[in-house]
């Protein structure tokens, strides 16, 4: 199921998409979309980013985090009760059915009569629980990538097994997107 | 090598149903996504339906969604097109194909044939 | 969805000589980041299944004969038999796998003359 995220009437809201880059600037395009990810691409369009730059986006609607380092959460400007409701962010991996997808829930509700004291951004990991985070070598070097639900530990070991391939191996390499396992 | 090996094929009434099977053998099914593509008579290749490695992830052509079902039993080395509400436009050979690394079809099934006539 | 588009539909070519294929898609199938054309070509011969024949644009499947190549980039590729023989006749098809619904031209017939 989606996982939620609320904002009040009036605020902005913020749903929370990542994804890592092979290398710095080695993007890939990345759709919005209001309604739960369709079989491909994103219905009802609200932004979308090529490998380079964001191409298309409507008003109220951006990116505020560095899409070239594959944040690529959207940020709702002044959200009204029309604004709640599921929406898509798909990451367009280039390959057959390579996209990830993340359907998220945004509720917005009418603000409260009393202001209450400014809380903490809703901790991430607890937001998403089965994003998975991979150590590389160096320090600080801790990497988010997007949900993938179809990858677990037997399959991460299969699919080691098929890399003595050599055509997948060199087409894993070159394909533009790593998951590094360490 | 790696062989792909069809049947469940014939003759349906249009609103009837067909399974059809793909038995594979030289490779481990589930570390690979696999497809079903068609090729009405006389027509060119029309993708189908794809299905992940694991089975979590179905994707359905829009001609197709709600009526087809593809699936697969790891354990048996197999995958399924389950077809339901069969049109006469379904009139096809049906391939199953095997997707290498997430790109392009390596492998092929000999095809069957469907006919949806009345 | 990416439409591709083959030209021409049939061609008849004298054995020896060389026969060329032209692919079109309705966007680039070009990823920049590792410099690949997402296209393969495909061939069918009467009552078989398709057989892979080229897969990112100009790399030849284990295999298949170098009269075969493959080129292009971006939205227009080629594929070429250098010298045709009589094997080679059958109807030959470009797919785009970059994104989407996996998409395959329409198909071009290539006899002898």
């Known amino acids: 199921s989606e996982v939620e995220y609320r904002a009040e009437v009036g605020q902005n809201a913020y749903l929370p998409c990542f994804y890592t880059p092979a290398a710095p600037g080695n993007l890939v395009p990345v759709c919005w979309g209001k309604g739960a990810c369709p079989v491909f691409e994103c219905g009802n369009v609200v932004l979308r980013t090529d490998e380079r730059d964001v191409n298309y986006w409507t008003s109220r609607y951006w990116l505020n985090g560095d899409f070239r380092k594959g944040d690529v959460s959207l940020t709702i400007e002044n959200v009204t009760l029309a604004d709640s409701g599921i929406y898509c962010c798909r990451i367009q991996i280039p390959g057959i059915m390579n996209d990830e997808k993340h359907n998220v829930k945004l509720v917005v509700i009418k603000p409260a009569k009393v202001t209450p004291a400014p809380t903490r951004q809703r901790d991430f990991t607890a937001a998403f629980p089965r994003m998975l985070t991979t150590r590389g070598h160096g320090p600080a070097e801790t990497q988010t990538l997007g949900s993938l639900p179809d990858i677990n530990l037997t399959q991460i070991s299969t699919l080691a097994n098929e890399l003595r391939d050599s055509r997948l191996a060199n087409d894993l390499r070159d394909s533009g997107a790593t998951i590094r396992i360490g | 090598q790696v062989q792909l090996q069809q049947s469940g094929g014939g003759l349906v009434q249009p609103g009837g149903s067909l399974r059809l099977s793909c038995a594979a053998s030289g490779f481990t099914l589930s570390s690979y996504a696999m497809s079903w593509v068609r090729q009405a008579p006389g027509k060119g290749l029309e993708w189908v339906s794809g299905?992940?490695?694991?089975?979590?992830?179905?994707y359905n052509a829009d001609s197709v969604k709600g009526r087809f079902t593809i699936s697969r039993d790891n354990s048996k080395n197999t995958l399924f097109l389950q077809m339901n509400s069969l049109r006469a436009e379904d009139t096809a050979v049906y391939y199953c194909?095997?997707?290498?690394?997430?790109?392009?079809?390596?492998?092929w099934g000999q095809g069957t044939l469907v006919t949806v006539s009345s | 969805e990416i439409v591709m588009t083959q030209s021409p539909d049939s061609l008849a070519v004298s054995l020896g000589e060389r026969a060329t294929i032209n692919c079109k898609s309705s966007q680039s199938v070009l990823y920049s980041s590792n410099n690949k054309n997402y296209l393969a070509w495909y061939q069918q011969k009467p009552g078989q299944p398709p057989k892979l024949l080229i897969y990112?644009?100009?790399t030849r499947e284990s295999g298949v004969p170098n009269r075969f190549s493959g080129s292009g980039s971006g939205t227009d590729f080629t594929l070429t038999i250098s010298s045709l023989q009589a094997e080679d006749v059958a109807v030959y098809y470009c797919q785009q796998y970059y994104s989407g619904p996996p998409t395959f031209g329409q198909g071009t017939k290539v006899e002898i003359k």
């Open positions: 194909a095997k997707i290498f690394g997430s790109y392009y079809f390596d492998y």
């Open positions: 990112w644009t100009s």
């Open positions: 299905i992940s490695g694991s089975g979590g992830s179905t």
